[in-house]
């Protein structure tokens, strides 16, 4: 069972400082951008990470949405990053969920962050390039220190 | 890097309660979880509980269910653990420690606070 | 009470290596995750493995830990005058819902 607390605004970065966005075809990739840049993107530079109460002893929830037009929040259904077109839910009755992320301070470094599946475990978010583009997607931990799977989080509020 | 500073040390008359405090500074303290552990004389660790402070409930071991109450306040970064109905048993060195990867890993530890229960 | 079953004691000459192992139920390590920490004398415990094989930065890859089934271990190579602490284990127990420690190994360095 998660149960939603507060939301915050984030902007989120890889450790090669590239910062995540959401395109014009909804697809979630990072790009080198200055802070002008960065502001001059929003709101697609701009996530809100929603935190949730967890009912078993598992780390901090989170759902991580965007707002342009409409609310998407992000989605790693069938091992697949996507943006959904919805609102975080108040409530999710159920122990894991495709929308739900444990947000991890890997120790020794509070400022670096993971995201695990709350439906695959030891699968992260990570970037990684594909052609000319780095995208957002979801990684067995295959390495130890797999810099790929770590994230500064900005707080925006 | 996050430091955890404990109060200092007590000596307690058995029946009593004790309270201790563990100040956090220096990185998130809301949602990150701070659990309570105890190391009496020559002994091994033991977890009493933990609380996750934006959620606001606590977790606590079934030995101490009833006894121990873990608290914290996010507007000083503080968490708080007593212990009630003391006992000679209870001497020990109590730690708090934070856990910001997952609640059962505990990556900070504060400098523990020894209480001594004895008439 | 101890649930985590860890050798009281074990010693080794420096430069060799050593294991501490650790064995639980499938309530506790068969189903969960395993962290050890380091206690030097006098002083609150250090992370010192997390995730069953994790290295937080600044713990020396002389340390490594490994899980299997319901057991796990911590190995230390290239063992050092420093080393000489208490070592636990420490798991979850869904039976007891709570977090479970083992009952500590000492090390001694010779």
């Known amino acids: 069972y998660f149960g939603k607390l507060e939301s915050k605004l984030s902007v989120i970065r890889n450790l090669n400082d590239q910062v995540l966005f959401i395109d014009q075809g909804n697809r979630p990739l990072f790009e080198d951008m200055t802070d002008s840049d960065c502001r001059d993107n929003a709101p697609r530079t701009i996530f809100i990470i929603s935190m949730y109460k967890d009912s078993q002893p598992r780390g901090m929830a989170v759902t991580i949405s965007v707002k342009c037009e409409k609310i998407s929040t992000l989605s790693c259904e069938n091992k697949i990053i996507s943006f959904k077109e919805m609102n975080p839910p108040d409530n999710i009755k159920d122990t894991k969920s495709d929308i739900i992320f444990f947000q991890r301070s890997v120790p020794g470094h509070d400022n670096k962050m993971q995201f695990e599946s709350s439906s695959y475990e030891g699968y992260f978010l990570a970037c990684e390039k594909e052609r000319d583009l780095f995208k957002l997607i979801l990684k067995k931990e295959d390495e130890l220190g797999d810099r790929s799977i770590m994230f500064t989080v900005q707080n925006e509020d | 890097q996050v430091q955890l500073v404990q109060s200092g040390a007590e000596v307690k008359k058995p029946g009593s309660s004790v309270k201790v405090s563990c100040k956090a500074s220096g990185g998130t303290f809301n949602s990150y979880a701070i659990s309570w552990v105890r190391q009496a004389p020559g002994q091994g660790l033991e977890w009493m509980g933990g609380?996750?402070?934006?959620?606001?409930?606590?977790n606590y071991a079934q030995k101490f269910q009833g006894r121990v109450t873990i608290t914290a306040d996010e507007s000083t970064s503080t968490a708080y653990m007593e212990l009630s109905s003391l006992r000679s048993e209870d001497t020990a060195v109590y730690y708090c420690?934070?856990?910001?990867?997952?609640?059962?890993?505990?990556?900070?530890w504060g400098q523990g606070t020894l209480v001594t229960v004895s008439s | 009470d101890i649930v985590l079953t860890q050798p009281p004691s074990v010693s080794g000459a420096p430069g060799q290596r050593v294991t501490i192992s650790c064995s639980g139920s499938?309530?506790?390590?068969?189903?969960?995750?395993v962290n050890w920490y380091q206690q030097l004398p006098g002083t609150a415990p250090k992370l010192l493995i997390y995730?069953?094989?994790h290295r937080p930065s600044g713990v020396p890859d002389r340390f490594s830990g490994s899980k299997s089934g319901t057991s796990a271990s911590l190995a230390i190579t290239g063992l050092q005058s420093e080393d000489e602490a208490d070592y636990y284990c420490q798991s979850w127990d869904y039976s007891g819902f709570s977090t479970v420690f083992g009952g500590g190994t000492k090390l001694t360095v010779l």
């Open positions: 499938s309530s506790n390590i068969g189903n969960h995750y």
């Open positions: 995730r069953n094989n």
């Open positions: 420690a934070r856990a910001a990867y997952h609640p059962l890993v505990f990556d900070n």
């Open positions: 609380i996750i402070p934006i959620y606001g409930t606590a």
